[in-house]
């Protein structure tokens, strides 16, 4: 399996709420020895590989944002501890999963990893992630309302 | 901030079962995986196994036969028996929480478990 | 199942030294490896996972490296509160393995 990225770049003004999205790509397993656990985290491109580094997001470490389920369950974070910070990360039963962001800052710009680690209990343990940089502007070169960049090419879109 | 801790008896009889329990505090345990670990005196680490809260397992295959872990997401506790004991199975057990793509980042203090007639 | 080697099984050292600790594993484990410090009548504690990540709250003189069946912990400067033993343990394959330790010990 395989972790799509829709948008590799969000540009969001501040005060804004945003959507970060990945999904969850190729067969999956919805057998009963399989589940898949499900984070996000913020990170750099660093040395060794994106993503591999792990940091907070909003104070919120990857444990704290974990979702875990089996297949293409549905499956929600502790929505007291996430939306004290404004976070929430949500999954469906398509393999689409996201973090919502409320009243973006400044300090939220960066890069953000999405990762998934598919459990085959008795046998092994394969993750995958995917990363998006998220860009929250000021001032009046910000735009209305976030603009996304598709990752397949440099078209943007608007999304309110 | 979770905590664990483990609690049974000291002191099991060869041929008899152990029966521990470790109850996790400051924290949901409807999420991550739940681990049992055990370090005989003066030795290493060894996994015995792991339950989610949904009540699936997965057991080390050297001691697969005589494990049992089980869950009751109510009392926030889950539960380790090993059968058939003999002193090779006295050690410090440790509860611990395991998070997929990660590790062991939260353990309980350990309980000794003798042994012997 | 994975076997995971440690070397040396003691290190003697004075504090401020450097300790390097190796992790070698019978098959890769990509970089699914951790570093766990356990002193006497103590839970282990986690150093480092995804083999050089380190947990919340490790000083910087911990550091980790390697990647398939080669890995390193190195403790840039001991402190006297770093004399334990040190655990390697893989998560790629079940059942899950720790390595058989490694005592530092003050010289």
């Known amino acids: 399996f395989k972790v799509a990225t829709p948008y590799s770049l969000y540009v969001c003004p501040e005060g804004q709420n945003v959507t970060l999205t990945c999904r969850l790509l190729g067969p999956v397993d919805k057998g009963h020895d399989v589940t898949f656990a499900k984070t996000w985290y913020r990170s750099s491109r660093g040395e060794v590989q994106t993503c591999s580094e792990r940091r907070p997001i909003r104070n919120l470490t990857f444990q704290d944002l974990h979702l875990h389920h089996g297949g293409h369950q549905a499956a929600n974070t502790s929505h007291d501890l996430a939306q004290r910070h404004g976070l929430e990360s949500a999954s469906d039963h398509h393999g689409n999963f996201s973090i919502t962001m409320r009243n973006l800052t400044l300090l939220d710009s960066g890069l953000y990893c999405c990762l998934v680690a598919e459990i085959r209990h008795h046998h092994s343990e394969h993750r995958v992630h995917g990363a998006m940089e998220l860009q929250v502007q000021t001032g009046k070169d910000a735009p209305s309302n976030c603009v996304v960049y598709p990752s397949s090419s440099q078209d943007s879109e608007n999304i309110t | 901030q979770v905590q664990l801790q483990e609690s049974g008896p000291g002191l099991v009889k060869p041929s008899e079962t152990l029966s521990l329990t470790c109850t996790v505090s400051?924290?949901?345990?409807?999420?991550?995986?739940w681990s049992w670990i055990r370090q005989p005196p003066g030795k290493g680490l060894e996994w015995i196994g792991y339950?989610?809260?949904?009540?699936?397992?997965n057991y080390n295959p050297s001691l697969k036969s005589r494990v049992t872990i089980s869950v009751d997401t109510s009392k926030s506790q889950f539960s380790l028996k090993l059968s058939s004991v003999t002193a090779a199975d006295t050690a410090v057990y440790y509860c611990?929480?395991?998070?997929?793509?990660?590790?062991?980042?939260?353990w309980g203090q350990g309980t000794m478990v003798i042994v012997s007639s | 199942e994975i076997v995971l080697t440690q070397s040396p099984a003691t290190l003697s050292l004075s504090p401020g030294e450097r300790a390097t600790l190796s992790c070698r594993a019978s098959?890769?484990?990509?970089?699914?490896l951790a570093w766990y410090q356990q002193k006497p009548g103590q839970a282990p504690r986690l150093l480092i996972y995804?083999?050089?990540n380190r947990a919340t709250g490790i000083p910087a003189r911990f550091s980790g490296s390697g990647s398939g069946t080669d890995f390193t912990l190195t403790i840039s400067s001991l402190e006297p509160e770093d004399f334990a033993v040190y655990y390697c343990?893989?998560?790629?394959?079940?059942?899950?393995?720790f390595g058989g330790g490694t005592k530092v010990e003050i010289k």
């Open positions: 611990a929480r395991d998070i997929p793509a990660f590790a062991f980042d939260i």
């Open positions: 400051g924290g949901s345990i409807s999420s991550y995986y």
């Open positions: 339950i989610y809260y949904s009540g699936s397992t």
């Open positions: 098959q890769s484990v990509s970089y699914y």
């Open positions: 995804d083999a050089f």
């Open positions: 343990q893989q998560r790629i394959n079940w059942p899950l393995t």
